[in-house]
């Protein structure tokens, strides 16, 4: 078991891989969307700038009972250095408008694709 430890538990996922996997998951969500995502739930929109991953998690974590975004919520928690719980909003999170989860995911996906193309993986 000692010898296999490294094999069974590979080291940290490279940031580029983690970002690519998050993008793939968001693409999957948008393409498989038949009924309104999360039944039309609305969340706070975010500034897609510094602290974006934590802000995205802070917004989406409030939506419960929506299996379609549970994996995204888990993946975003890997990008956010601090623990995020429902109802928590950082000072970076400006609450100016709410949008449907479907639109939130589309906006986030477009921005993450741009970051990936530019090589900004963190």
């Amino acid at each position: 078991l000692t010898c296999l430890g490294g094999f069974a538990s590979p080291g940290p996922v490279p940031p580029s891989t983690a970002l690519r996997e998050l993008i793939e998951e968001l693409v999957n969500i948008t393409q498989n969307q038949k009924a309104p995502l999360c039944n039309g739930s609305m969340v706070w929109s975010i500034n897609l700038t510094a602290g974006m991953y934590c802000a995205a998690l802070e917004s989406l974590i409030n939506v419960s009972g929506c299996s379609a975004i549970e994996k995204t919520q888990r993946m975003l928690s890997g990008f956010c250095p601090h623990k995020v719980s429902a109802g928590q909003f950082s000072s970076l999170h400006v609450r100016d408008t709410k949008i449907e989860v479907a639109q939130f995911v589309k906006d986030l996906l477009l921005h993450l694709k741009k970051l990936f193309r530019e090589g900004q993986f963190n």
């Epitope: 039944n39 609305m42 969340v43 409030n62 929506c66």
Partner: nanobody
Framework: EVQLLESGGGLVQPGGSLRLSCVAS????????MDWVRQAPGKGLEWVST????????YYADSVKGRFTISRDNSKNTLYLQMNSLRAEDTAVYYC?????????WGPGTLVTVSS
């Protein structure tokens, strides 16, 4: 089970006022963030306003800022939306919603028609 019932809609002339109410049951109202959302004929959902559980935080869409006021009475499990200086573009079905829940848990809505 979450239940919400809106009332107070109707036909009003441009520049007029209406007060919408929403009675909530089936959840702990006083700790819930609450929203007003609207849907104009043939259009998508548009967020209108949000109020925090404590009433300390109130938030408005730019399109209604300065004209609409959201409030709540936790002792009556009731959410309100005071709508002043109404415009034709405010015509919509208005829904009260427990924040972050899907449409299946929203009320049936109340129709507001602004027309001369």
């Amino acid at each position: 089970e979450v239940q919400l019932l809106e009332s107070g809609g109707g036909l009003v002339q441009p520049g007029g006022s209406l007060r919408l109410s929403c009675v909530a049951s089936g959840f702990t109202f006083d700790v819930a963030e609450m929203d007003w959302v609207r849907q104009a004929p043939g259009k998508g959902l548009e967020w209108v306003s949000t109020i925090s559980p404590s009433r300390r935080g109130t938030y408005y869409a730019d399109s209604v800022k300065g004209r609409f006021t959201i409030s709540r009475d936790n002792s009556k499990n009731t959410l309100y939306l005071q709508m002043n200086s109404l415009r034709a573009e405010d015509t919509a079905v208005y829904y009260c919603a427990k924040a972050y829940t899907g449409r299946s848990l929203w009320g049936p809505g109340t129709l507001v028609t602004v027309s001369s």
